[in-house]
């Protein structure tokens, strides 16, 4: 197959891939807000054999505007053609196409974390699913940022196998009675643009020698 | 009703060139992908290539690098240029609304407009 990607503006839909918990979402929007579709359906091919477009049969007919494809891309090494078809009733209202290779296009959404502060550390608890497929690993790293009084700090764990259960990190050396904030997010090697996660913060609570300086008050 | 008119189809040696048309009415062209399929003597439909509504082009591998699809959305005009053809491109060529999916689609609505490829 032969392909070209030029800057037109008239596609009728964006679409973008993302990895939500390890899961490859794809999502999209219309740009013309007034085509209101009752529902959509999703087909997809790879780019080394176009005839052979197969409907997503869990994004057939579907009034969502994003799909799970995790059991249907597999390959990174792969270019995958989405086409999507927008209808009112049985009218075909749009139908547009993007072309995506996962390894350049897929943005990574933030783990979902905890943290518990104590008097002079943090622990930051990552939650992972419980099995992540080797495919979808993406040679990502994991960065949890600390900061403090307009100072960051990155602290990037080593994880032992894959990224799948729930990890803890201990964020240790920390000053008492002093507020911390922490994000977390997954970086690719081929540094792409990271999402953060918003901030978490808590205040530490004071250490022994403030308590009893407090209490001899 | 969606309406397709094709035309630009004739007799050509190998090696030879034709520039196919689809004329479009009936639906916002802009907003559909368009796609050729062909039916040689005999056989079923093909799906030849496709373009979206942006301009994303795709080719089946037997004309990679010999037609070139392209669309005028201000005309609501489909093109395909075949270049270099050979005797086994000879066939009723056909227009589709949307990317068209055999077993899936229905058959495109238009007359086609006959290529023959022979020395």
């Known amino acids: 197959i032969s392909y070209d990607s030029p800057d037109y503006t008239d596609e009728s839909c964006t679409f973008k891939i993302s990895l939500r918990n390890f899961r490859s979402i794809l999502s999209w929007e219309l740009k013309n807000h007034s085509i209101v579709p009752t529902h959509y359906t999703l087909l997809y091919t790879i780019m080394s054999k176009p005839e052979d477009l197969k409907v997503v049969k869990n994004c057939a007919n579907t009034t969502r505007s994003f799909c799970d494809l995790t059991d249907e891309w597999r390959s990174t090494h792969e270019a995958y053609v989405t086409v999507l078809e927008g209808f009112s009733g049985n009218t075909t209202l749009f139908s547009c196409s993007h072309n995506f290779w996962l390894a350049i296009d897929m943005s990574f959404e933030p783990p979902e974390f905890e943290i518990v502060g104590f008097t002079n550390h943090i622990n930051v608890m990552v939650k992972f699913p419980s099995i992540v497929e080797e495919e979808l690993q993406f040679d990502l790293s994991l960065v949890i940022e600390e900061q403090s009084e307009g100072i960051v700090k990155k602290h990037k764990p080593e994880i032992k196998g894959n990224m799948s259960g729930n990890f803890t990190y201990i964020i240790d050396k920390l000053i008492p009675n002093t507020n911390y904030c922490v994000s977390v997010y997954l970086e690719h090697s081929d540094e792409q643009a990271v999402i953060k996660s918003p901030l978490k913060c808590t205040l530490l609570p004071p250490g022994q020698e403030s308590e009893s300086a407090e209490s001899a008050k | 009703q969606v309406q397709l008119q094709e035309s630009g189809g004739g007799s050509v040696q190998p090696g030879g060139s034709l520039r196919l048309s689809c004329a479009a009415s009936?639906?916002?062209?802009?907003?559909?992908?368009m796609s050729w399929v062909r039916q040689a003597p005999g056989k079923g439909l093909e799906w030849v290539s496709a373009i979206s509504g942006g301009g994303n082009t795709y080719y089946t591998d037997s004309v990679k690098g010999r037609f070139t699809i392209s669309r005028d959305n201000a005309k609501n005009t489909l093109y395909l240029q075949l270049n270099s053809l050979k005797t086994e491109d000879t066939a009723m060529y056909y227009c589709?609304?949307?990317?068209?999916?055999?077993?899936?689609?229905?058959?495109?609505p238009g007359q086609g407009t006959q290529v023959t490829v022979s020395s």
């Open positions: 589709a609304q949307n990317w068209w999916v055999a077993g899936r689609s229905p058959n495109p």
């Open positions: 009936g639906f916002t062209f802009s907003n559909y992908i």
